[in-house]
């Protein structure tokens, strides 16, 4: 028996990891899942961010695992991407939904950041640079739209490279090579990771590499 | 269409323990929802009490700390409160009530008098 | 425990009138708050849930509105049988709490 205390809770099951699967919510005493109709990468990022889990790295349409049982919980589930719980995004009511079947329980898949990497290259030292990220064991780039000194002070700051001198596009320091892996990136600044400020998902761009982005972090421009 | 139906003593002594029971009809306890009891004082102020689950878990309101007790007796279809130490300030109308996370049914109520 | 603060307590009003209760939670509950309505000596019907969602069998002139604090239950066009006791409840969290009730007279 429970006294009080809120009476929702969220995992991810049947995935490779805590931080993939199918998306479950414990809803007075029961986990059911939730209907892809509408799904986003929204709805991913405030699941991945509420279980501790970063980064959205993909929201499947369905689960690419077993499908559910048990109640469906959740359908046309609506997120802004800054909600602190799947519950606060718009839905069609507890328990409400169009018709759904297990057949098309939602699926997410974050990562926990450990198999991600970033460096900056070509800038004569490592806290300079073109920005390159290691995602899913390949290296990337990453694009110069809307990239902003917000951008270069979360690098800078992961880098431990000290503060955001400046930042470029352009491929100012020189062409990559590989996936893109984001573009048009948004940041506030304050984030521990690149990859923890909101993007349309690894690898969504329109970009090539004539776009790649770099930076030049305080402890690199004292080295120049 | 769930019906919910409230029976009770209608007068308890302070101190007593208060035993209600709810019958549903044309729905089976155990397959679904949640069953709740909900209490309305004389100003007309709605007080949740607690509810059980059809999978058996309970949910109890903590201002009610450990007074509160909700069952089910599966083989009558009926689900039961029981409030202990009772005082004036339990006397209310009490309704049991269902839905699957909704309140969405509600029996027609019982008054309960708490009076030596 | 979340307190639902409504207002106003009382309200009088005619046939045909547009009428709006507001219902504040003590803290964000998201978009889960539900309405009620109360005829004497009978039990409170659910009109709305899930803050704008119609319960079943509800008549259109119902309709709500609101998020995080502030709720709103409009009655668009009043009829004789909607004077009654209106009451909001939220459903975010346990314990579930209830407002104080608005009761809704005749002019």
């Known amino acids: 028996s429970s006294l009080g205390g809120t009476d929702k809770e969220l995992r991810l099951v049947d995935g490779e990891n805590k931080c993939s699967g199918r998306v479950e919510v414990k809803v007075q005493e029961e986990w059911g899942t939730v209907c892809n109709n509408g799904w986003s990468m929204e709805a991913v990022s405030v699941i991945c961010n509420q279980l501790g889990c970063p980064t959205a790295i993909k929201a499947p349409g369905w689960a690419n695992s077993s499908a559910g049982s048990g109640r469906i919980w959740m359908d046309h589930v609506s997120c802004r991407g800054n909600e602190s719980a799947l519950w606060d995004c718009k839905h069609d009511g507890w328990g409400k939904h169009s018709n759904c079947t297990h057949q098309q329980d939602a699926g997410v898949t974050c990562s926990d950041g450990s198999n991600l990497e970033m460096r900056l290259t070509r800038g004569g030292n490592m806290c300079s640079g073109r920005i390159e990220i290691k995602f899913q064991g390949r290296w990337g780039t990453v694009c110069d739209d809307n990239f902003n000194i917000d951008h270069a002070s979360v690098i800078c700051r992961q880098l431990e490279c000290g503060s955001a001198v400046s930042f470029s596009g352009s491929s100012n320091f020189g062409e990559g090579s590989g996936p893109i892996w984001f573009d048009d990136l948004i940041c506030n600044g304050n984030e521990s990771a690149l990859w923890n400020c909101k993007h349309q998902g690894w690898g969504k761009h329109n970009c090539d590499h004539a776009e790649d982005a770099g930076v030049i972090c305080s402890k690199g421009a004292d080295l120049s | 269409q769930v019906q919910l139906q409230e029976s009770g003593p209608g007068l308890v002594k302070p101190s007593e323990t208060l035993s209600l029971t709810c019958t549903v009809s044309?729905?089976?306890?155990?397959?679904?929802?949640?069953w709740n009891w909900i209490r309305q004082f004389p100003g007309k102020k709605l007080e949740w009490m607690g509810s059980i689950y059809y999978s058996g878990s309970t949910y109890y309101n903590p201002s009610l700390k450990s007074r509160v007790t909700i069952s089910v007796d599966t083989s009558k279809n009926q689900f039961s409160l029981k409030l202990s130490s009772v005082t004036a300030a339990d006397t209310a109308t009490y309704y049991c009530?269902?839905?699957?996370?909704?309140?969405?049914?509600w029996g027609q109520g019982t008054t309960l008098t708490v009076s030596s | 425990d979340i307190v639902m603060t409504q207002s106003p307590s009382s309200l009088s009003a005619s046939v045909g009138d547009r009428v709006t209760i507001t219902c504040r939670a003590s803290q964000s509950v998201s978009s889960d708050v539900a309405w009620f309505q109360q005829k004497p000596g009978k039990s409170p019907k659910p009109l709305i849930y899930?803050?704008?969602s119609l319960q079943s069998g509800v008549p259109s002139r119902f309709s709500g509105s609101g998020s995080g604090t502030d709720f709103t239950l409009t009655i668009s066009s009043l009829q004789a049988e909607d004077f009654a006791v209106y009451f909001c409840g939220q459903d975010y969290t346990s314990p579930r709490t209830f407002g104080g009730g608005t009761k809704l007279e005749i002019k």
């Open positions: 044309g729905y089976s306890i155990t397959s679904d929802y949640a």
């Open positions: 009530v269902s839905g699957t996370y909704y309140f969405d049914y």
């Open positions: 899930y803050a704008s």
